[in-house]
Each structure stands twice: as C-alpha cells, then as structure tokens.
C-alpha cells in the first residue's frame, strides 16, 4: 500500500539503485517515486553532514522485502516512494529554495525582476529543467537579478551549494503550466534524427510517448514497429533530444513512428502510467512472482498491488491454466520496460498501474459564510482541491467554496445550503482559477446527494459540515485532485503552515473576487479563540485561525472552502471555513469546522453501497 511517513534522523542502509542531488526530501521522494526500481529513499540536508560531496545527497533504494535497516543519522530524512499513492503522484514541484544554488549546465542568462519571473522563463524554455536567480542583494553587483536557466544529464542538479542571496527552483512544465504548447500528433512512417538519450522497448507508440514525456531529457522520439525490417530493432523506442529542441531532420521510413514529448502541454499531461492491456503479446523480464488468477484484469491488479512489479504477462496456454485460472507472470527490469516483447502469443500483457494518479474511487485520509481579506492571487494548480459551489436560479452566482476529497465527493459547510437544499439548482466547478473563465460551455458537476450533518441547526455555528456526492466521478489532473483528510481526532500535530483559499469578499462589504485568493493564517488555540468570542461556545470540534492584529481572514463567499496545512510535505484539510465576527477584524479570528473531529462521520457517509469504506490511505 501507500506509505507517506517520513523518518527523521534516520538513514536506510544498503539497497542503493541511484543517487543524485536534490534540494529537499520531498523532491528526493518524487525522484524515487518516478524511478522504476526505487521503493525507499534517504536524504542528507546540508546541516546533517560535513562532507561537502554528500550534502543534499538523495539516495534511491530498492529492497526485495520492501524495507531496509534504518541507522541513526542526525538530520537525515528517509521515507518511501509514493508509488501506489494515487493522486499524490506528481512530478510537479513548485518550491523555491532560498540560499541555495543548484548547479548544472548554464545555457541561458537574462536579467529579470523576480525569482517567479525566472521560474516562468524556465517553464517556458523547452530545454530548461531548473534555474538559479541572484537576488538584488547578491554580493557581486554585476550578477544581481541574473536568471540562469539550466539542464543536466539526469534532470537534477550536478551539485547544490549553499549560497546567500541566491534562489533556485525547478521548471513547472510537469505542472502542465508551460506556455510553449505541445505537438499531439504522431507521424507514421517518419524517423527523427539527432541525439538518442535512451532506448527502451515498448508495445506501441503511445507508451513510447509517455516514457519520453516523463524522461528528463527526451524532447521527441522515434518508435520502430513490430513489423520493422530489422528484427532486433522491433519495438525499440528511441528517446531523443537536440540542441535546438526540435528534430534537425526527419526521414521517411516505412514502419517507424515519430512524435514529441507532451511535457510542454498546457493544462493536461498524460498520466505517468500505461493502463492498456495488449492481447497476444508477451512481455519478458526478470521474474518476480507467478500466481494463478482469473482473468487478465485481475493479473494487472495483482501486479499493481505488488509494489515491485512493473509489468506482467497473463498466459492462456493450456499448460498454464487450471480450471478458470491461468498463470500471471509478474515481472520487472532495470528501466521499467520489458526486456523482450513477443507478438502473436497466447498471452496478454500490460503494465502495473502503481504510478496512475487517478487512484481509486475514494476519499483520501492519512493514518498518522464567509474573497479572502488580505490575500493574494493564487496560480494554476496551486489548490487543485478547491471548488466553487454556484447556484443557478434566474442568474448564476458563486455562493460557497468546497474541497474535493474523492472522485465523487466534496466537503463543504452545512450553512451553504441554508434555504437552498435543492440539489438541482447547484453547479460545482472544479479545476478553475478565474470565475470569469466560466462560460455556458464550461463543464460542471451536478449534485447527486447533499448530506448535511444530522446535528447541524440553521443559524447555529455547531456541526457546520456537509458532504456533496457528485452525480459522476471526476478524473484527477494537476488542476483537479483531492486534498487528504487528517487522522481521526488529530490533536498531536502542530501545524505551522496553514492557508485559507476562496473567491469570497476582499473586505466586509465587498464583492466576490474573480481570481482565487490565498492567505497564510496561523492557527489560534481554542482557549485564545474562546476569549475573543465570549458570547459563543468554541467547541473542540472547531478550530480557529487569524492574526491578533487582524487584516487577513476568510470572508463572505469563502464559506465551505478549505483551511489547509502543510505538514511533512503533504497538505491536509484541517478546517472548513465556517463563521467569524465580520472579516479580518482585530482579535476576531476566523472559526472553522475541525475536520479531524468528523472523520467517523465522513467515513460512514462516504462508504460505498457494497459496504466498503471508500478510503484511500496514503499512510
């Protein structure tokens, strides 16, 4: 299953499959997730080691048993790959690292006014993988405001150095934020020239293209079909690059197919997995296990559940079958691709779905009335769980926020439905940033069921929580995916990085905002909160957040939206925007429904009709 816990001051011994430099443990974990054989990782921050060569070291590890012995190492951080973790699987990494210079091949230098502008330039440059920016206070005046665009053979820095007044980060192309745009077309009977960066075997051009998309240096590819004249080159997928970023030449060639990486696509990237099953095809590789199962789909599920399994072959040969079950060969290789592909067989083959980010049809948990005042504009994909609850009567308007917690579930505030309990009048918009982008053609979700907490009473602040079941499940993308819920009764975690988002009023007597707003707000203890609201009962099922001096808060139109906190690199839904005295007033924090206190209720209500909890636990 999915394991998200990080181990502080611990280092996994042995099992090394690769090493690289990464700026933090989260980026190291992401590289582990996308490495075909990595199950575990250990990261050494600069503070944890004196050896300059090992600072920022990220060590990717494999283990036949799925675990390795941990040794104590002060400052080290270790953890698991996020394979099998559904919607948490993403190559997108937005963080900017202050005081750090990520080294690589500097291929472009320009003057820009901010680190965000530098990151944007990197994202819009086809070859840029990461960047460094010298701030206005950099010690050498001639380098100030320099934006250095960089790449390296492996897509990660060749070294990372601590350097004051330098900020570094990665391209946001994996976040589907590139302005370059992409070529979706595949060209038959055409071979591209230029430099081969890798060679893998794939059953079709589509798998070749997806592998190219997620390879750090692949810009385009040529695939040799299974009827290519040279037998030893059949099914070869050549991943390619060039200085210019485009093929310098192409040659008409029967039974070849060429195309481009889709990394520069805007708004949609292909999933980093291959779900199609190939009938009459055998995939060769290192044998992991053989099991008898009923049907090729069960074979694929078995492979997906066995974390080391990369691909499989389901044999229909009479000698491989008994009764209704046949042999399911679970296999792996060094690069995650078959070492041999045979056609015209009595088998069916396919890949593990461990890197699919759709996950299951569930809500996400972990085991361990009211624009935002004083906020700033959000960017695409920053809060992909945020939804807009709109009512269509004579006109259509935004009324509340909400949080996507599963393919078919939204969590919001009960008071949003005061006087509007009719599900037909509601439209739920997900994966949006600007309300003005909504037109009559914009897809929306309709409500199948509104589940208001049984103890909620209109015009009371208690139990202000409601679940919405959507009529049809939503697909997950970089711009539309769920937020994880906290553990039941989560009281031990100290959250220090919390944000509230919404399209609500920017001042008490304001109006709904166009661009989704965000504001960083500290949590306030319930005791402190109670002092500020002596006429109300602040219960343990509420959580408060706000600045003593005011100025930043949720407001009308943010109700039902998320209060999210980042802990150990993972966002969790801590609160639901509920109520407050005015907006952003001094010593009047916002009051939020405490989600951890309602976990039993959420799980009970989101149970599937067959009685299984619709849960996906990343821990």
């Amino acid at each position: 299953g999915c394991l998200t816990q990080l181990y502080e001051n611990a280092f996994f011994r042995g099992g090394d499959v690769a090493s690289m430099y990464t700026p933090n443990a989260q980026y190291c974990q992401m590289r582990c997730t996308f490495h075909p054989r990595c199950l575990l990782f250990s990261f050494l921050p600069a503070s944890s080691i004196n050896d300059m060569e090992k600072r920022f070291g990220c060590f990717l590890k494999d283990s036949v048993t799925g675990t390795l012995p941990k040794v104590h190492r002060t400052g080290a951080v270790s953890g698991h790959s996020l394979k099998q973790c559904g919607h948490q699987i993403s190559a997108c990494h937005r963080d900017i690292y202050k005081g750090v210079d990520m080294r690589g091949v500097n291929f472009n230098v320009s003057k820009v006014s901010s680190v965000e502008e530098c990151q944007k330039r990197c994202t819009s440059n086809i070859r840029c993988q990461f960047f460094s920016y010298a701030t206005q206070t950099f010690h050498k005046a001639e380098y100030r405001n320099n934006c250095l665009l960089k790449y390296s053979p492996g897509g990660t820095p060749t070294a990372i150095k601590v350097l004051s007044n330098v900020e570094s980060g990665f391209s946001l192309k994996p976040c589907a934020l590139s302005e370059i745009g992409c070529h979706m077309n595949i060209f038959q009977h055409l071979a591209f020239s230029d430099v081969d960066v890798a060679r893998v075997l794939t059953p079709d051009a589509f798998v070749c293209r997806t592998i190219c998309t997620y390879h750090p240096n692949c810009l385009f590819f040529t695939f040799y079909t299974n009827v290519w004249k040279i037998e030893s080159q059949r099914n070869v997928c050549l991943l390619k690059t060039s200085e210019s970023g485009t093929p310098s030449s192409s040659t008409p060639q029967e039974n070849t197919i060429s195309g481009y990486s889709l990394l520069t696509c805007k708004r949609t990237l292909p999933e980093p997995c291959h779900s199609k099953i190939y009938p009459g095809v055998d995939f060769g590789g290192e044998e992991l296990n053989v099991t008898f199962v009923k049907g090729v789909n069960v074979c694929q599920e078995t492979c997906t559940k066995m974390i080391r399994c990369q691909f499989f072959t389901y044999s229909l040969l009479p000698e491989d079958c008994k009764e209704e079950k046949c042999k399911c060969f679970l296999r792996l290789s060094m690069d995650g691709s078959p070492t041999r592909i045979a056609y015209g067989t009595q088998g069916s083959s396919g890949y593990s779905l461990r890197l699919c980010n759709t996950g299951d049809n569930s809500v996400c948990t972990t085991k361990t009335s009211t624009r935002i005042v004083g906020g700033t504009n959000s960017s695409w994909g920053e809060w992909p769980w945020q939804v807009s609850l709109q009512v269509k009567l004579t006109a259509q308007r935004h009324l509340c926020g909400g949080s996507l917690i599963g393919h078919q579930w939204v969590l919001t505030a009960a008071h949003c439905f005061d006087g509007l309990p009719l599900q037909d009048v509601w439209r739920i918009y997900s994966g949006i940033l600007n309300l003005s982008d909504i037109t009559k053609d914009t897809p929306f979700s309709q409500i199948k069921e509104i589940i208001i907490h049984q103890n909620y009473k209109v015009s009371e602040g208690n139990h202000d929580i409601a679940l919405i079941k959507l009529q049809a499940p939503l697909n997950y993308t970089e711009f539309q995916k769920p937020i994880c819920l906290p553990s039941k009764g989560d009281t031990s975690t100290i959250y220090t990085n919390c944000w509230v988002t919404g399209w609500g009023f920017s001042k008490e007597k304001g109006e709904i905002q166009n661009i989704l707003q965000k504001v960083n707000i500290p949590l306030v203890t319930n005791e402190e909160c109670q002092k500020r609201y002596q006429d109300y009962k602040i219960t343990q099922r509420m959580v408060c957040a706000g600045y003593k001096e005011g100025g930043k808060d949720a407001c009308k139109g943010d109700s039902g939206g998320p209060l999210v906190c980042k802990h150990n690199g993972m966002w969790r839904l801590v609160g639901i925007t509920s109520w407050g005295e005015g907006c952003a007033r001094r010593e009047q924090p916002g009051v939020y429904t405490k989600v951890a206190e309602y976990m039993d209720w959420i799980l009970e209500k989101t149970q599937s009709s067959d009685g299984k909890a619709q849960m996906q636990s990343p821990a």
Epitope: F206, N226, V227, I257, P279, G280, V281, Y343, G344
Partner: antibody, heavy 119, light 107 residues
Framework: EVQLLESGGGLVQPGGSLRLSCAAS????????MAWVRQAPGKGLEWVSY????????SYADSVKGRFTISRDNSKNTLYLQMNSLRAEDTAVYYC????????????WGQGTLVTVSS | DIQMTQSPSSVSASVGDRITITCRTR??????LNWYQQKPGEPPKLLIF???SLQSGVPSRFSGSGTGTEFTLTISSLQPEDLAIYYC?????????FGQGTKLEIK
C-alpha cells in the same frame, strides 16, 4: 500496394453456416494482426472479431461469441471467418481489415462481402 | 464493453462551414481513439488515429482533439467530397467498439 479481397458471402438460411475468406497482398501478412468488422444494411459499423499475427490469440464481440471462429493461414496469406448458427441479425457487409497495433487502428480495409441470412 | 456515444447523429452544412463531431466514453480511454470516414458505397477509411494524428494522405482540414473521455473531430472548411458518415472507435480495450456514426450532408 496493400490489397484485401473478401469472398464467400451470399444468401444463407437461418441456422446455416458460411465461411468468409480474405486474401491479402502487398504486405507481410504473417506479421499483421487482422480483424473482421461488419455493417448491417443502413446501420453503423460493428466490431466482430480479432486475431493476432500468429493466430494464437483471438477475440469476439459478445453478439457472435460461440458461433463465429476467426482463423488465418499465413502460408496462404488468407484470413477466415467461419460463421455457424447464422441469424437474421447477422445480415451485413463483412469487411476484412489490417490492425496496426503500434497506432491501435484499422488502417486498411477490404471492399467487403455481403452476407444475407434469410429464409 | 466500452460504449461510445457520438453526437450529433446527423448534420447538414454548407461548403466552407466548420463542422464539429463529438464522441464520448464513460471510462477514460487515454487517447486510444480513431476516426473513420465512410463515403456512400465505399468501405471505411482511417482519417485520424490516436485522437489527433492525421493518417497520411488525409487533407489537413480534418483535425482531432481530446483525451480521456471526450473527443472531437473537426472539419475546418467543409468540401463537397466530405459527404460521408463519420465513425469514432475506441482501441483501448477489446472489443474495439465504434460510435453509432454521424451522417454529414451538404446543403
């Protein structure tokens, strides 16, 4: 030039049998997966059956499962469809197609042969 | 089996018009979607594979787009010879089902 020529169609009574053939030329037949697709008069296309290059794997639409058998003879560059227990609803033009697995599409089609099931 | 829903079932348009045909599936099929053109009295012909890739020899006025569950075929400027029935087909899972077809008539 790729050519696919279907034959064997005709009039048959309900419950009867018919064997369709598809003679292929202009490409290496033994390396291609093949399929049969049919079209009832005035209706849309319906996927019927599929066979991999060696003949080792076959697949059928639910509507013909247990009654139709797809096969091939790579030495004769010929694809077959054995149709038993024919019903009136099997009346259609039957097309033979090459299946290009690397792009997952039927890239070449024959002209079709008409099968009429009627008493 | 994966069900394909094609719309509209028929469309009548003038030469030079822009035409859009939609194909939807219940489950995601990535971009394993093809479009075929069948002119009266002829067998079908592959127009577009992989949702957006033009088969060689097909005029560039034809284009395809979409991924997942919703796909479109667009004819940017309708020509008299485009009179035909257009079919979408998923090639994600056997049996490789077709849409019910869209009949395109020229006004």
């Amino acid at each position: 030039e790729v050519q696919l020529l279907e034959s064997g169609g005709g009039l048959v009574q309900p419950g009867g049998s018919l064997r369709l053939s598809c003679a292929a030329s202009g490409f290496t037949f033994s390396e291609y997966d093949m399929a049969w697709v049919r079209q009832a008069p005035g209706k849309g296309l319906e996927w019927v059956s599929y066979i991999v290059s060696s003949g080792g794997f076959t697949s059928y639409a639910d509507s013909v499962k247990g009654r139709f058998t797809i096969s091939r003879d790579n030495s004769k560059n010929t694809l077959y469809l054995q149709m038993n227990s024919l019903r009136a609803e099997d009346t259609a033009v039957y097309y033979c197609t090459t299946w290009a697995g690397w792009i997952a599409a039927a890239d070449y089609w024959g002209q079709g042969t008409l099968v009429t099931v009627s008493s | 089996d994966i069900q394909m829903t094609q719309s509209p079932s028929s469309v009548s348009a003038s030469v030079g018009d822009r035409i859009t045909i939609t194909c939807r599936t219940r489950q995601s099929i990535s971009n394993y979607l093809n479009w075929y053109q069948q002119k009266p009295g002829e067998p079908p012909k592959l127009l577009i594979f992989a949702a957006s890739s033009l088969q060689s020899g097909v005029p560039s006025r034809f284009s395809g787009s979409g991924t997942g569950t919703e796909f479109t075929l667009t004819i940017s400027s309708l020509q008299p010879e485009d009179l035909a029935i257009y079919y979408c087909q998923q090639s994600y899972d056997i049996p490789f089902t077709f849409g019910q077809g869209t009949k395109l008539e020229i006004k």
